[in-house]
Structure formats: structure tokens, C-alpha cells
């Protein structure tokens, strides 16, 4: 039967994003219509026709466009991507004997981890703080030269969308880390990034 | 040239089947959906389904309730409508035609079905 | 079903008259309309598509314009050769649907 082939995309917060959707047909539709999926009923977006060229629903007008004027592919793309955008969005083909046939490409935005790493000696103890701030969580992570160091760690969510993960690193004989390498790893979608401190006496 | 050549004429008794042919010759035969049209005596042209031979996807006009079926041979460049369940009001001539979107070029020269006991 | 109704179901001109058909459906049908011409014996011959848009090799006097549920054919000069049947198509919901037809005669 005739379908739509499409592709979820992941992109950084506040840069440009696309979604392509391609109708697997011999013949091109007669309009295409973009819509973003809602809980109640999908809001239409833009639509290209032969007859009207591009047209952008007002909410949208600043927002996107066609960038591939095809009816048989089709991609828009947003100029800059916000996490309102975040989403499920459908392309519809309104095609000639087959009626509407649909696809539907989802979009994830990121923000890449903000990290920070710093220590701080009491007089018994050594803790050592990482914190990243991230989109989706992160996860955190430590290398210590030796086992059986406790860590503790908190998670806070921000209205932004973003999720701070913090772990602290209590070190009970803080003279035996001084000049000996941290390290704090953070796992962010699939890539881990290694963050190195090296304790010295204050 | 374009070109689209149907069966010939045929007369049915009520109940029995008929199967139309539509050979297509001077284009890629894929390109362009086929469409069948009927024509009873002294009344409106009626659409009764098409296919899309690239992927031999149809669509029935759900009056003929799954009577008419719509196939085609990609080898031959030859599409089909198969009438079952005749009855004295299939009695028509029979077109086939092709359509890349909704432009309508060519057709073929009609078949008439004539269902009579 | 969508249901197209052609106005008038006959009609009588001379040759060089100018000549409107007009088809009504009975709900919004877009841009998505056809005409076709079909004489005695012979299988349809597709005018306008889109509502508007000529076919490749048909005489310019046939232009044809509307949307939404009102349509119209319109012959600028007939020509001897125009004398026929002249029906609608709508094709923007399934099943596809012809208007009724429109005999076009010489008076």
C-alpha cells in the first residue's frame, strides 16, 4: 500500500531544524499539509499546493517554512528551534484516488550539558561537587583512584526544561587525594564527556 | 503513440462475471494510475475504481458493495475490472482511462457489457 | 456521497454563441473539479482540471472557473464541433462523482 516514509530528528535548543517527509507513490499528491499533533485535535501549520503556493497558518509565520517545495517530498524546517517545538508533527498528502495518506516525524530538542566541578576541604573531609545541567537528564558519574568513596546525588528539573543532576563525592582522608586526579563523567545522549580535577592542598 | 486498447464486447447472463481488459501501450505503464468509468444507456458517466499500478493499490467505489475488482499485469501493461453478481443494470459500456494526478488524457474505446438471460 | 447537479440538463445555441454550464455540489468540493465532453459512442474527453486548468490540446474558448460548491463551464464562441454532452467530476472526496450532464444542442 501507498506510505509515508519519514524520520525523527533531535536538535539543539535555539538552532534550525528539519523534518522530511516523502510519499512513496507514483504519482504526487495535490496538496500537502503540515499539522503538529495536540492532545485534542492537530493544529494545522502550512500547506503547498500548485494552485496556492505556501501558505503559513499566522502562529506559524515566523516560526517556518517549506523549504522543500515538493508534493511528493516535503520538508519544513524552523529557523530556530524553541521546547514549545518539541513534538510530534504529520504530513498529510492529500493525493489524487487515494485520499488522504499520512506520516508523522518527531522532534526532540537537547541542550547540551553545562558542567561545573569544583572541591572544598573541611577539616576532616573532602567533597568534590559535579554538577550538569542538561536536555534530556544527564547522568553523573566518578572515577576515583580507589573503591569504597561514597557519593551522594540530587536531581532538580527547571521550568526551562532542563534537569540539573548534582553528585558530591564525600572523601573521609581528604590528605591521601591530595595530587590525585578526579574524574567526573557525564553520560548525555549516548556520548560520555570526561570532566578532570586534580585536588591540591588550599 | 498513447494508447489504450480494451476487450470486446461481451454479453453475460444475470449472476455470471465479466472481466474488462485495458492494455496500455506508448508510456511507462506505472506512471499513471488507471481509473475504469461506466456509462448506462441514457444515463450519467459513474466511477467505479482505479489503480495505481506501481503499486497495484485500488480504490472501489463502494456502490458496486465489493463486486468490482480492479487488478493489473505490470509485465503486460494491462489492467483489469472484474464485475461480479451481474445483473440486468450492469448493462453499460465500460472505459477505462489513465490519469497522472487529476489529468485525465487518454482513454480507451469503451466495452460494451450487455446482461441479459 | 458527494452529489453534483448540472444546470441546465439542456440547452439550445448557435455557433458562435457564447455558452455557460454550470455544475453545484453539494458540499465544498475545493478546486477539486473536472469537465469532460463526451459525444455519441465515444468515451469522454477531459476538458478542464483543477476546476480551471485547460488540458493539454483543448481550444482555448473552453475555460472553466469556481470553488468550493459552485462551478462553471464556459464555450466563448461554439464551434460546430462543440455540440455534445458535457458533464462535471468531482474528485475531492471518494467516491468520485459526475454531475448528471448537460446536452449541448444545436437550435
Known amino acids: 500500500q501507498v506510505q509515508v516514509v519519514t524520520q525523527d530528528e533531535r536538535e539543539q535548543l535555539y538552532t534550525p531544524a528539519s523534518l522530511k517527509c516523502s510519499l512513496q507513490n507514483a504519482q504526487e499528491a495535490l496538496i500537502v499539509t503540515w499539522q503538529k499533533k495536540k492532545a485534542v485535535s492537530p493544529e494545522n501549520m502550512v500547506t503547498f499546493s500548485e494552485n496556492h503556493g505556501v501558505v503559513i497558518q499566522p502562529a506559524y509565520k515566523d516560526k517556518i517554512n517549506i523549504t522543500q517545495l515538493g508534493l511528493q517530498n516535503s520538508t519544513i524546517t524552523f529557523w530556530n528551534i524553541t521546547l514549545e517545538d518539541e513534538g510530534c508533527y504529520m504530513c498529510l498528502f492529500n493525493t489524487f484516488g487515494f485520499g488522504k495518506i499520512s506520516g508523522t516525524a518527531c522532534l526532540t530538542v537537547y541542550v547540551q550539558p553545562i558542567v561545573s566541578l569544583h572541591y572544598k576541604f573541611s577539616e576532616d573531609h573532602l567533597n568534590i561537587t559535579c554538577s550538569a545541567t542538561a536536555r534530556p537528564a544527564p547522568m553523573v558519574f566518578w572515577k576515583v583512584p580507589r573503591s569504597g568513596i561514597e557519593n551522594s546525588t540530587v536531581t532538580l528539573s527547571h521550568p526551562n526544561g532542563t534537569t540539573s543532576v548534582t553528585s558530591i563525592l564525600h572523601i573521609k582522608d581528604p590528605k591521601n587525594q591530595v595530587g590525585k586526579e578526579v574524574i567526573c563523567q557525564v553520560l548525555h545522549l549516548g556520548t560520555v564527556t570526561d570532566f578532570k580535577q586534580t585536588v591540591n592542598k588550599g | 503513440q498513447v494508447q489504450l486498447v480494451q476487450s470486446g464486447a461481451e454479453v453475460k447472463k444475470p449472476g455470471a462475471s465479466v472481466k474488462v481488459s485495458c492494455k496500455a501501450s506508448?508510456?511507462?505503464?506505472?506512471?499513471?494510475?488507471i481509473l475504469w468509468v461506466r456509462q448506462a444507456p441514457g444515463q450519467r458517466l459513474e466511477w467505479m475504481g482505479h489503480i495505481d499500478p506501481y503499486y497495484g493499490s485500488s480504490n472501489y467505489n463502494l456502490k458496486f458493495k465489493g463486486r468490482v475488482t480492479i487488478t493489473r499485469d505490470t509485465s503486460a501493461s494491462t489492467a483489469y475490472m472484474e464485475l461480479s453478481s451481474l445483473r440486468s443494470e450492469d448493462t453499460a459500456v465500460y472505459y477505462c482511462g489513465r490519469s497522472k494526478r487529476d489529468y485525465f488524457d487518454y482513454w480507451g474505446q469503451g466495452t460494451l457489457v450487455t446482461v441479459s438471460s | 456521497d458527494i452529489q453534483m447537479t448540472q444546470s441546465p440538463s439542456s440547452l439550445y445555441a448557435s455557433v458562435g454563441d457564447r455558452v455557460t454550464i454550470t455544475c453545484k455540489a453539494s458540499?465544498?468540493?475545493?478546486?477539486?473539479l473536472s469537465w469532460f465532453q463526451q459525444k455519441p459512442g465515444k468515451a469522454p474527453k477531459s476538458l478542464i482540471y483543477r476546476a480551471n486548468r485547460l488540458v493539454d490540446g483543448v481550444p482555448s474558448r473552453f475555460s472553466g472557473s469556481g470553488s468550493g460548491t459552485d462551478f462553471t463551464l464556459t464555450i466563448s464562441s461554439l464551434q460546430p464541433e462543440d455540440f455534445a454532452t458535457y458533464y462535471c467530476l468531482q474528485y475531492d472526496e471518494f467516491p468520485y462523482t459526475f454531475g448528471q450532464g448537460t446536452k449541448l444542442e444545436i437550435k
Open positions: 458540499q465544498d468540493i475545493n478546486s477539486y
Open positions: 506508448g508510456y511507462s505503464f506505472t506512471d499513471y494510475i
